[in-house]
């Protein structure tokens, strides 16, 4: 009968969920030592604390392997929710962006926030502006008082994701023509001037709308 009692008591002790994966366990404090590949985690519930043996550490903790015993250690990285090691975050707190294992409220220069994953990814790299082009109107450099001059810049490196926009790569400004009157020329008829003005405006809008030289978003085309 004594044997039967010991067996049943041992069975209930092993089946107690708090003791799962333990090498030594008590009803009050839970595990104090874990099986080889498991991580020891000290859980706090109000005033009480007890040990658990887990396959992976909970959010906010990372698995620290040691010869005596593997333990769950708290992430000490600022604004980090869960981490891979003591100095590498894998998920930041709400409102912060993950970048190279750290959490930022704004992505560093050259990186752009990817809202769906709250990560900083390589952004769009643009070159220097070209010089302003010739002041012209309706493809003419004379015959008007005012014209438009345009400048452009290259996309040097495309963004990692299509959802990341590049800065403007073409811009125009009003300019004063160097020659108000064309030598021996006539003024452009008003209707033609209007048509050409619309055409040029459309071209500039299209250039500004594109956020990459050869990028996939194609908002202008879809």
């Amino acid at each position: 009968q004594g044997n039967r009692w010991r067996r049943s008591k041992r069975a209930s002790y092993v089946s107690n969920p708090i003791c799962k994966g333990c090498l030594s366990c008590s009803k009050d404090n839970g595990c104090s030592r874990c099986q080889q590949k498991l991580f020891f985690f000290l859980r706090r519930e109000g005033m009480r604390q007890y040990g658990e043996c887990l396959h992976s550490c909970p959010s906010g903790y990372y698995g620290h392997r040691a010869p005596d015993m593997n333990r769950c250690a708290r992430c000490r990285i600022e604004n980090c929710d869960s981490c891979f090691s003591k100095d590498f975050c894998t998920k930041c707190k709400v409102g912060f962006y993950l970048h190279r294992g750290r959490c930022f409220d704004e992505c560093p220069d050259g990186f752009a926030p990817l809202e769906e994953t709250m990560e900083c990814v390589e952004g769009c790299e643009v070159g220097h502006w070209s010089e302003w082009g010739t002041c012209s109107r309706n493809n003419r450099t004379c015959g008007f008082k005012w014209g438009l001059e345009t400048r452009t810049r290259q996309i040097v490196k495309k963004p990692v994701k299509d959802t990341i926009l590049c800065p403007t790569i073409a811009e125009s400004r009003r300019c004063k023509m160097t020659m108000r009157h064309c030598p021996g020329g006539k003024r452009t008829p008003k209707a033609k001037e209007k048509r050409n003005k619309k055409k040029k405006r459309k071209l500039i809008e299209r250039a500004q709308e594109q956020h990459s030289v050869f990028l996939a978003t194609d908002r202008a085309n879809q």
């Epitope: 290259q154 050869f214 990028l215 085309n221």
Partner: antibody, heavy 118, light 110 residues
Framework: QVQLKESGPGLVQPSQTLSLTCTVS????????IHWVRQPPGKGLEWMGA???????YYNSNLKSRVIITRDTSKSQVLLKLNNLQHEDTAMYYC????????????WGQGIQVTVSS | QPLLTQSPSVSASLGASVKLTCTLS???????IEWYQQHPDKSPKFLMQ??????SKGDGIPDRFSGSSSGAHRYLSISNLQLEDEAIYYC?????????FGSGTQLTVL
């Protein structure tokens, strides 16, 4: 491995439409932009246009009214249509892949010789 | 749109050095350009991308090939010329939704 291969007719009659296919392997058309470039005999390279990884298209303004580039991602193919062919459209036609992040052509097809003649 | 100017032909002796020039239209002197090499009856091959300050080469391009810049000029330098360097060299440039090639320079190795 990454490859591009052009296919289509070698001979087309003037005023007809040229249809060329660029079949790609080793990468996805939804990740890369594909361009068409041609080279008339003894002359330099001329950029014709491109289909973006997002599906949009851009063309050389000198050819704009005559050229159409489309793609079929399920077949990994990019198609070039050039209508109202003239003798000066006789050229070697290449498709080329644009590098993922930088704007240059990192992989080229072997090219296909197209002759416009009656 | 940018224009690229290249001299039609250059010749140099085997083992010597040569410098090919590609000139951007002055408005675009800050632009990156690319150099491509094309052997007879072969497809063009990417050599390098060249900015006004640095260059990055394609895979497997020998150290004999290098790039440099000065103002609107972009240079491709080849040292210790080999017979296999005999080819046409094109420069190319991207702008807003287009790509432009230079007319090409025929390099002859004597």
């Amino acid at each position: 491995q990454v490859q591009l291969k052009e296919s289509g007719p070698g001979l087309v009659q003037p005023s007809q439409t040229l249809s060329l296919t660029c079949t790609v392997s080793g990468f996805s058309l939804t990740s890369y932009n594909i361009h068409w470039v041609r080279q008339p005999p003894g002359k330099g390279l001329e950029w014709m246009g491109a289909v973006w990884r997002g599906g949009g298209t851009y063309y050389n303004s000198n050819l704009k009214s005559r050229v159409i580039i489309t793609r079929d991602t399920s077949k990994s193919q990019v198609l070039l249509k050039l209508n109202n062919l003239q003798h000066e459209d006789t050229a070697m036609y290449y498709c080329a892949r644009e590098e993922l992040r930088y704007v240059y052509f990192d992989v080229w097809g072997q090219g296909i010789q197209v002759t416009v003649s009656s | 749109q940018p224009l690229l100017t290249q001299s039609p032909s250059v010749s140099a002796s085997l083992g010597a050095s040569v410098k090919l020039t590609c000139t951007l239209s002055s408005q675009y002197n800050t632009y990156y350009i690319e150099w491509y090499q094309q052997h007879p009856d072969k497809s063009p091959k990417f050599l390098m991308q060249l900015s006004d300050g640095s260059h990055s080469k394609g895979d497997g391009i020998p150290d004999r090939f290098s790039g440099s810049s000065s103002g609107a000029h972009r240079y491709l330098s080849i040292s210790n010329l080999q017979l296999e360097d005999e080819a046409i060299y094109y420069c190319g440039v991207s702008d807003v939704s287009l790509y432009v090639f230079g007319s090409g320079t025929q390099l002859t190795v004597l």
